[in-house]
Interface confidence: medium
């Protein structure tokens, strides 16, 4: 997953400690798991469990690892090349259009509807009308602020910055 980059994600730069491996940049870029030194001569490894980088880069800083919020479980820890993967706890889900928090799944469908999809970490239960079979979200859909329609991509149970 190619998760990029917020101002808060930038880890404070520290002088390379002896345990931080150094290598030379390739075409001015450093490999995943590293960032470039200020003079551009070295690639400095990220610190395991503290920060990471996921792609070839000329970042002056590795990116700070995400800490899972309360209400989330950690699926996989932060490594030097991948951010922490967090997932909503059982019974809650994270919607693509409100990714900052886990929301409780509904416990049942409205009258006249039947459940056709279970609560998952990335979707609420899915209800359809008994007769017509049309889907119902249980809420008035919010007007999405979009640029254009674009090919859809499925939600995945992963940290937003990982």
């Amino acid at each position: 997953e190619s998760a990029l980059i917020t101002q808060q994600d930038l880890a404070p730069q520290q002088r390379a400690a002896p345990q931080q491996k150094r290598s030379s940049p390739s075409e001015g870029l450093c490999p995943p798991g590293h960032h470039i030194s200020e003079d551009g001569r070295d690639c400095i490894s990220c610190k395991y469990g503290q920060d990471y980088s996921t792609h070839w880069n000329d970042l002056l800083f590795c990116l700070r690892c995400t800490r899972c919020d309360s209400g989330e479980v950690e699926l996989s820890p932060c490594t030097t090349t991948r951010n922490t993967v967090c997932q909503c706890e059982e019974g809650t889900f994270r919607e693509e259009d409100s990714p900052e928090m886990c929301r409780k799944c509904r416990t049942g469908c409205p009258r006249g509807m039947v459940k056709v999809g279970d609560c998952t970490p990335w979707s609420d239960i899915e209800c359809v009308h008994k007769e017509s079979g049309t889907k119902h979200s249980g809420e008035v859909p919010a007007v999405e602020e979009t640029v254009t329609s674009s090919p859809g991509t499925p939600a995945s149970p992963c940290s937003l910055s990982g």
Epitope: S2, I5, Q7, L10, H35, N57, L59, L60, T146, C158
Partner: nanobody, 125 residues
Amino acid sequence: EVQLLESGGGEVQPGGSLRLSCAASGRSISNYAMGWFRQAPGKEREFVSASVWNQGGNYYAESVKGRFTISRDNAKNTLYLQMSSLRAEDTAVYYCVVARTPETPITSARGANYWGQGTLVTVKP
């Protein structure tokens, strides 16, 4: 509402160059992460490159490292992608994306960032 308009796509021979532009309107881009993704026919959308504002630097997919260069002009509210040594496998629709908030990262499959309509790049002899 944020509007993104890509331009600069077209047909080019292998080894050729193109420069894509993405003009943003509706807000200043200076404090927001921006990037480029692409989608080849019959394939999933994939990350190409991303730009961090001010000091941070840039990210590149391994497949474009050393051939593509991302840059931005905050005064013009525009993101660029200079593509050189183009290959047939670079053929795709290229999409510009900008983060929804300063705290929002740009992700490959999630995040509901703002997307442009895309510009087609075709590399063929």
